[in-house]
């Protein structure tokens, strides 16, 4: 039985040409992670591995850095960032955990973080 | 240059151990994840597992855990692979190879070591 | 463990032909291949990484496509030293694995 919830940092805003870090913490569960995904929407972003450390994909490398921890840091924003990002947590044995983040990126100075929430 | 240079061919027996080297150089050996790849005879590529060569953590592909045992020596930038309990089953070319930096490609591949178990 | 199949384990074709290798994998891994060339007696060498970019050094003969479960490796005018193995490679989740290889022939 899957006992993990995921928490992240909902839906979040920042500006344009700034940048952002997106979190996922799993808990209620003892399972072991074996990696972690980023994706948006469709596209593969990154991969973190406790071992074999992170993998960047290409189209994204001048503009995502790795962490802090298990997390993704997001820099140079543009509006066409905006959208949906997952956290993908592979755990044994429990299987598979996904936290969803929503990020609005805007043209003001005017941007606030969100509330954070939990996906069971 | 980036060199992976792995030993020599190994003839042993089933039930025995055998432990395979992968001396690197050109390159900042801990910088940069080391794997194993096993190519059966007429057979495809399997992932073997890896090795970050900064901590020593480790993760296999859960088929070989318990079979292959991956260490590091960083004073002489040299990756190991040990099999044990050895059955004709792992006779096979075993190859080390490096990852791109934050990227999880294999750039780089030793020659291969040819292992054969025989009695 | 995800299953990546290359349908054809061999392709017969000549010299300035255009040819096109396939994999399947048996679940979706966005853009996380890669294409492996192995010559005779040698190791793997790296081609095309993330579904679509070519490896430093190798020429631009050889281009990658696809996303998610289909994927495609072309070349576009083979020449005499492509002969070789091509594997597909996903590491979208460990254990990482390998298409079981199409074995290009020169007519």
């Known amino acids: 039985m899957m006992t993990g919830t995921i928490e992240t940092t909902g839906n979040i805003s920042a500006e344009k040409g700034g940048s952002i870090i997106l979190q996922c913490h799993l808990s209620s569960t003892t399972a072991q992670v074996t990696q972690v995904n980023w994706e948006q929407q469709d596209q593969l972003l990154a991969i973190c591995n406790a071992d074999l450390g992170w993998h960047i994909s290409p189209s994204f490398k001048d503009r995502v850095a790795p962490g802090p921890g298990l997390g993704l840091t997001l820099q140079s924003l543009t509006v066409n960032d905006t959208g949906e990002y997952f956290c993908i947590y592979h755990t044994y044995p429990d299987g598979t955990y996904t936290g969803r983040i929503f990020l609005e990126v805007l043209e003001s100075s005017v941007a606030e973080h969100g509330a954070r929430f939990q996906i069971p | 240059e980036v060199q992976l240079q792995q030993s020599g061919p190994e003839l042993v027996k089933p039930g025995a151990s055998v432990k395979i080297s992968c001396k690197t150089s050109?390159?900042?050996?801990?910088?940069?994840?080391m794997h194993w790849v096993k190519q059966s005879h007429g057979k495809s590529l399997e992932w073997i597992g890896g090795?970050?060569?900064?901590?020593?953590?480790?993760t296999y592909n859960q088929k070989f855990k318990g079979k292959a045992t991956l260490t590091v020596d960083k004073s002489s930038s040299t990756a190991y692979m040990e099999f044990r309990s050895l059955t004709s089953e792992d006779s096979a070319v075993y190859y080390c190879?490096?990852?791109?930096?934050?990227?999880?490609?294999?750039?780089?591949w030793g020659q291969g070591t040819t292992l054969t178990v025989s009695s | 463990d995800i299953v990546m199949t290359q349908s054809h384990k061999f392709m017969s074709t000549s010299v300035g032909d255009r040819v096109s290798i396939t994999c399947k994998a048996s679940?979706?891994?966005?853009?996380?291949v890669a294409w492996y060339q192995q010559k005779p007696g040698q190791s793997p060498k790296l081609l095309i990484y993330?579904?679509?970019y070519r490896y430093t050094g190798v020429p631009d003969r050889f281009t990658g496509s696809g996303s998610g479960t289909d994927f495609t490796f072309t070349i576009s005018s083979v020449q005499a030293e492509d002969l070789a193995l091509y594997y597909c490679?996903?590491?979208?989740?460990?254990?990482?694995?390998f298409g079981g290889g199409t074995k290009l022939e020169i007519k």
């Open positions: 190879a490096k990852l791109l930096r934050l990227m999880y490609y294999f750039d780089y």
């Open positions: 050109g390159y900042a050996f801990t910088e940069y994840t």
């Open positions: 090795i970050n060569p900064n901590t020593g953590g480790t």
């Open positions: 679940q979706d891994v966005r853009t996380a």
């Open positions: 993330s579904a679509s």
């Open positions: 490679h996903q590491h979208y989740i460990t254990p990482w694995t």
